[in-house]
């Protein structure tokens, strides 16, 4: 199920994007530099494992984890999380946990797009990937 | 470990120009926010602007945009600060200091370099 | 731009003293931008709560941090000599950033 995100995808568009980053508490300068990127997203499977990574000018990231299985994450805003990733109906559900807190990132495939639904209390930013 | 590094005085008379010098190791120099940070004697910190390396980006105060320019050498992990058309209200200990992410807070802080405007 | 009104300016404790110090915040921020550092005469500032409760590496668990929106406190549970500095509070949550006059501390 997971080979339909399987490719390298480019970030074309973002919708609400600092607004999401306020709510998580990211902060002025992370948010200006993080706002700026046009990161690439890379994802591989290897038997169970899955693997994100994101390329950018602000920061490269990448995660390999095991569906369902807690795992610990550095974002590229540099939070230090507890993440678990799941699928359900064809969505991957990725929820971070840190300070108390909880956000929730949905990647999903809309005909030959990637799209990635952030959310944070009441604020969702909607990012948009085309295969590169 | 981190570290930056910055001289510690500089003499200068009014009106000339100076470069203040940051010097940072330990970490990735390309991926961390420098400020600069000014103090006067006996008074509290007033934040001068930030420069993200890995772009050259600055964010500046606005008090301090026709004094103060921002630049960085990424292949030194040197971040530079020049002032310009200084007075005697430029006399003071300037910091530079690593911004950390996500909270965007001063997690190291340069030992401060003493500007000392005088004729 | 976001005001940091902290108080008292100047204080006096004993030793075993509790002590508290606020930082009054003119619009409402996120409790993750909100954060405290020590300087003492002649040296540099150091990180010491970031995140309004997070200490810094090395920091006594005799200090904590709390508070959210507009009004946030750094208290230390009893007083000793070695904490006798200037303590500010500083935001980037909004544009500019901001400190916070200081606070400075003597011990009695």
């Known amino acids: 199920m997971c080979d339909a995100f399987v490719g390298t995808w480019k970030l074309v568009s973002s919708e609400n994007f600092d607004d999401y980053m306020k709510e998580v508490g990211v902060g002025f300068a992370t948010r200006k530099v993080a706002g700026m990127a046009k990161p690439n997203m890379i994802i591989s499977v290897n038997g169970d494992v899955i693997t994100i990574k994101s390329e950018s000018t602000f920061k490269n990231t990448e995660i390999s984890f095991i569906l369902g299985q807690e795992f610990d994450e550095v974002t590229a805003d540099d939070r230090k999380v507890k993440s678990t990733i799941t699928l359900d109906g064809g969505v991957l559900v990725h929820v971070q946990k840190w300070d108390g807190k909880s956000t929730t990132i949905k990647r999903k495939r809309e005909d030959d797009k990637l799209v990635v639904e952030c959310v944070m209390k009441g604020v969702t930013s909607t990012r948009v990937y085309e295969r590169a | 470990q981190v570290q930056l590094q910055q001289p510690g005085a500089e003499l200068v008379k009014p009106g000339a120009s100076v470069k203040l010098s940051c010097k940072a190791s330990?970490?990735?120099?390309?991926?961390?926010?420098i400020t600069w940070v000014k103090q006067r004697p006996g008074q509290g910190l007033e934040w001068i602007g930030d420069i993200y390396p890995g772009s050259g980006s600055t964010t500046n105060n606005e008090k301090f945009k026709s004094k103060a320019t921002l630049t960085v050498d990424t292949s030194s992990s040197t971040a530079y600060m020049q002032l310009s058309s200084l007075t005697s209200e430029d006399s003071a200990v300037y910091y530079c200091?690593?911004?950390?992410?996500?909270?965007?807070?001063?997690?190291?802080w340069g030992q401060g370099t003493t500007l000392t405007v005088s004729s | 731009e976001v005001v940091l009104t902290q108080s008292p300016a100047l204080m006096a404790a004993s030793p075993g003293e509790k002590v508290t110090i606020t930082c009054s915040v003119s619009s409402s921020i996120s409790s993750s931008n909100l954060h405290w550092y020590q300087q003492k005469s002649e040296t540099s500032p150091k990180p010491w709560i970031y995140?309004?409760?997070n200490l810094a590496s090395g920091v006594p668990v005799r200090f904590s941090g709390s508070g959210s929106g507009t009004s946030y406190s750094l208290t230390i549970s009893s007083m000793e000599a070695e904490d006798a500095a200037t303590y500010y509070c500083?935001?980037?949550?909004?544009?500019?950033?901001?400190f916070g006059a200081g606070t400075k501390l003597e011990l009695k």
């Open positions: 200091a690593r911004l950390r992410g996500y909270y965007d807070y001063f997690d190291f």
């Open positions: 995140g309004t409760s």
């Open positions: 330990g970490y990735t120099f390309t991926s961390n926010w």
């Open positions: 500083q935001q980037w949550s909004h544009y500019p950033l901001t």
